[in-house]
């Protein structure tokens, strides 16, 4: 039985040629992380393996760190990349957990700062 | 130029062991994750494992959790497959394969080493 | 563990040919999936990674596209060196998994 529950940072704002920070928490299970997989919609961004590592997409490898932990740093922010984030966790013995965090990348520099894990 | 050199052919009884090792130049090896791929007689590439020398960490396929063991020694640059209580249907050849920086794919192999499991 | 099924198992055409393979997974995983070319007694060469990035040094007749659980290997002009074997393989989650190949022959 999946008893896990997955934290985002839940709806985030940054500004457009910022940096963002998506995280996701995975908690309330014992199970054992195996990979964090970092989608946006029918796009693969990255993946980090606890033992293997990271794989950056080639399509973001210039604007994608790696990290903090499991999460993923996002820059050089365009419009475009306004939408859906999907951090995908793949535990065992569980199974697969999914959380959605959702980005607006504002043009002017009215974003708001409150999210928990964003890059002022 | 990144070079993986195997070591040689190795015939062995069912139920022993065998150690595959695999010597990595014209790279730092801890910079990239060592995987061991292999292929029996006619039939498709199968990925046993990989093991991360830069932090230890190994990941194996669950159909040789147990029997494989992935190891690096980093000074003498140097990644070694062992495969324990060998068995006819082990009977394959053994390549190394590195993944690329920050990539999961394969971009440089050894030039695999046979293994055969004989009575 | 995700399935990869390429067609067809073997294929043969003529020299200057275009030369289409398919690979499909048993589930979507986005573009992690890389295509090697293996000659007999010769270990696995990428030549594409990502669904479609050309590796470094490829010649430019191979071509890879697809994303999800449909993936398509392209020669656009066989040439009698690319007389192989032709695996896809993923890479979205372990345990890695390869498809059963493509041995391709000449006419």
């Known amino acids: 039985m999946m008893t896990g529950t997955i934290e985002t940072t839940g709806n985030i704002s940054a500004e457009k040629g910022g940096s963002i920070i998506l995280q996701c928490h995975l908690s309330s299970t014992t199970a054992q992380v195996t990979q964090v997989n970092w989608e946006q919609q029918d796009q693969l961004l990255a993946i980090c393996n606890a033992d293997l590592g990271w794989h950056i997409s080639p399509s973001f490898k210039d604007r994608v760190a790696p990290g903090p932990g499991l999460g993923l740093t996002l820059q050089s922010l365009t419009v475009n990349d306004t939408g859906e984030y999907f951090c995908i966790y793949h535990t065992y013995p569980d199974g697969t957990y999914t959380g959605r965090i959702f980005l607006e990348v504002l043009e002017s520099s009215v974003a708001e700062h409150g999210a928990r894990f964003q890059i002022p | 130029q990144v070079q993986l050199v195997q070591s040689g052919a190795e015939v062995k009884k069912p139920g022993a062991s065998v150690k595959v090792s695999c010597k990595a130049s014209?790279?730092?090896?801890?910079?990239?994750?060592m995987h061991w791929v292999r292929q029996a007689p006619g039939q498709r590439l199968e990925w046993i494992g990989g093991?991360?020398?830069?932090?230890?960490?190994?990941s194996y396929s669950q159909k040789f959790q147990g029997r494989a063991t992935l190891t690096v020694d980093t000074s003498a640059s140097t990644a070694y497959m062992e495969l324990s209580s060998l068995r006819s249907e082990d009977t394959a050849v053994y390549y190394c394969?590195?993944?690329?920086?920050?990539?999961?794919?394969?971009?440089?192999w050894g030039q695999g080493t046979t293994v055969t499991v004989s009575s | 563990d995700i399935q990869m099924t390429q067609s067809p198992s073997s294929l043969s055409a003529s020299v200057g040919d275009r030369v289409t393979i398919t690979c499909q997974a048993s589930?979507?995983?986005?573009?992690?999936l890389a295509w090697y070319q293996q000659k007999p007694g010769k270990a696995p060469k990428l030549l594409i990674y990502?669904?479609?990035y050309r590796y470094t040094g490829v010649p430019s007749r191979f071509s890879g596209s697809g994303s999800g659980t449909d993936f398509t290997f392209t020669i656009s002009s066989l040439q009698p060196e690319d007389i192989a074997t032709y695996y896809c393989?993923?890479?979205?989650?372990?345990?890695?998994?390869f498809g059963g190949g493509t041995k391709l022959e000449i006419k």
């Open positions: 394969t590195r993944s690329s920086y920050y990539r999961y794919d394969l971009d440089y």
């Open positions: 014209g790279y730092t090896i801890t910079e990239n994750t």
């Open positions: 093991i991360n020398p830069n932090q230890g960490g190994t």
């Open positions: 589930q979507d995983i986005k573009t992690a």
């Open positions: 990502s669904a479609s």
């Open positions: 393989h993923q890479h979205y989650t372990t345990p890695w998994t």
